[in-house]
Interface confidence: low
């Protein structure tokens, strides 16, 4: 897959592939994978991709199922790149506070918070 | 502060405190703090709280500004707890795929993705 494919298109294609190969992927009845118990997915990217690795090692490769795992590894690459950008630029306190305020604002309105 | 305060209320109070103490916090003109360059905040919690630590060490404590940093440390505690819950429960492949699909769905609709 060319890495030039826009990430948004990559995600859409991966969702379609996941749907297509679901039956094959769930064939292993005994396999157990850690699943996060909340919906703040971005906090759990490491565990999600560890789970994908476990699944890949247990799945017969070939055809479009291989493309699914290739896509997922490109998505991981994108997320790793985003994580690198978390601490790349040093800015004034003012700008840091803007980001902190935005983060808390998003946490306040969009996170699924259990008290 | 009692940790029994619901996290949602804690976040709201922290936003108010941050607003009130902004002038005091930006007093240090020379301080530079790493600021993420994208809006997928959850990926950057580690860097955000490192920045808060830097800011705290440079801020004259006392009164409600102390409460601000106490609140922020409670929010960090909550997020750390959420991160622990990322890999706590081992489930069937079926349930993992549900979560993965949900994650990709959220990424597809809610993430700010630069190609």
């Amino acid at each position: 897959i060319p890495t030039e494919i826009p990430t948004s298109a990559l995600v859409k294609e991966t969702l379609a592939l996941l749907s297509t190969h679901r039956t094959l992927l769930i064939a292993n009845e005994t396999l157990r994978i850690p699943v996060p118990v909340h919906k703040n997915h971005q906090l759990c990217t490491e565990e999600i991709f560890q789970g994908i690795g476990t699944l890949e090692s247990q799945t017969v490769q070939g055809g479009t199922v291989e493309r699914l795992f290739k896509n997922l590894s490109l998505i991981k690459k994108y997320i790793d790149g985003q994580k690198k950008k978390c601490g790349e630029e040093r800015r004034r306190v003012n700008q840091f506070l803007d980001y902190l305020q935005e983060f808390l604002g998003v946490m306040n309105t969009e996170w699924i918070i259990e008290s | 502060i009692p940790t029994e305060i619901p996290t949602s209320a804690l976040v709201k109070e922290t936003l108010a405190l941050l607003s009130t103490h902004r002038t005091l916090l930006i007093a240090n003109e020379t301080l530079r703090i790493p600021v993420p360059v994208h809006k997928n905040h959850q990926l950057c919690t580690e860097e955000i709280f490192q920045g808060i630590g830097t800011l705290e060490s440079q801020t004259v404590q006392g009164g409600t500004v102390e409460r601000l940093f106490k609140n922020l440390s409670l929010i960090k505690k909550y997020i750390d707890g959420q991160k622990k819950k990322c890999g706590e429960e081992r489930r069937r492949v079926n349930q993992f795929l549900d979560y993965l699909q949900e994650f990709l769905g959220v990424m597809n609709t809610e993430w700010i993705i630069e190609s």
């Epitope: 003012n94 803007d98 305020q101 935005e102 808390l104 604002g105 306040n108 | 209320a9 709201k12 109070e13 936003l15 108010a16 405190l17 941050l18 607003s19 009130t20 902004r22």
Partner: nanobody, 122 residues
Framework: QVQLVESGGGSVQAGGSLRLSCAAS??????????MGWFRQSPGKEREGSLA???????AYAGSVKGRFTISVDNAKNILYLQMNNLKPEDTAMYYC??????????????WGQGTQVTVSS
């Protein structure tokens, strides 16, 4: 267009009290969904940071007014209040109310009022 209008300012002796009000014109504006605050600007000085902030029931105060000033909001009437007790000459200033999403007054103020003058004499 939403406008914030302050009232209740005036002249008072040190130790006295005043209650400032801030009303919004425009039916679409609801105080309950905004972060609301009071600011002040003394003659010849820059506008100070927020004196008091209220956001969805949570309040915060600057050290200089804590224990003397109380911020509150009447969501039904869409009015923001600032009860000022034990006033000091250094409280003399033009007082402004402001509204913003997520309390981001400095980088993204949504609405500002025109201000109401408070004068405290010794």
């Amino acid at each position: 267009q939403v406008q914030l209008v302050e009232s209740g300012g005036g002249s008072v002796q040190a130790g006295g009290s005043l209650r400032l009000s801030c009303a919004a014109s425009g039916n679409t504006f609801s105080f309950s969904t905004y972060c609301m605050g009071w600011f002040r600007q003394s003659p010849g000085k820059e506008r100070e940071g927020s004196l008091a902030t209220i956001y969805d029931g949570s309040t915060a105060y600057a050290g200089s007014v804590k224990g003397r000033f109380t911020i509150s909001v009447d969501n039904a009437k869409n009015i923001l209040y600032l009860q000022m007790n034990n006033l000091k000459p250094e409280d003399t200033a033009m007082y402004y109310c402001a509204a913003a999403k997520y309390c981001m007054f400095w980088s993204d103020p949504s609405y500002w009022g025109q201000g109401t003058q408070v004068t405290v004499s010794s």
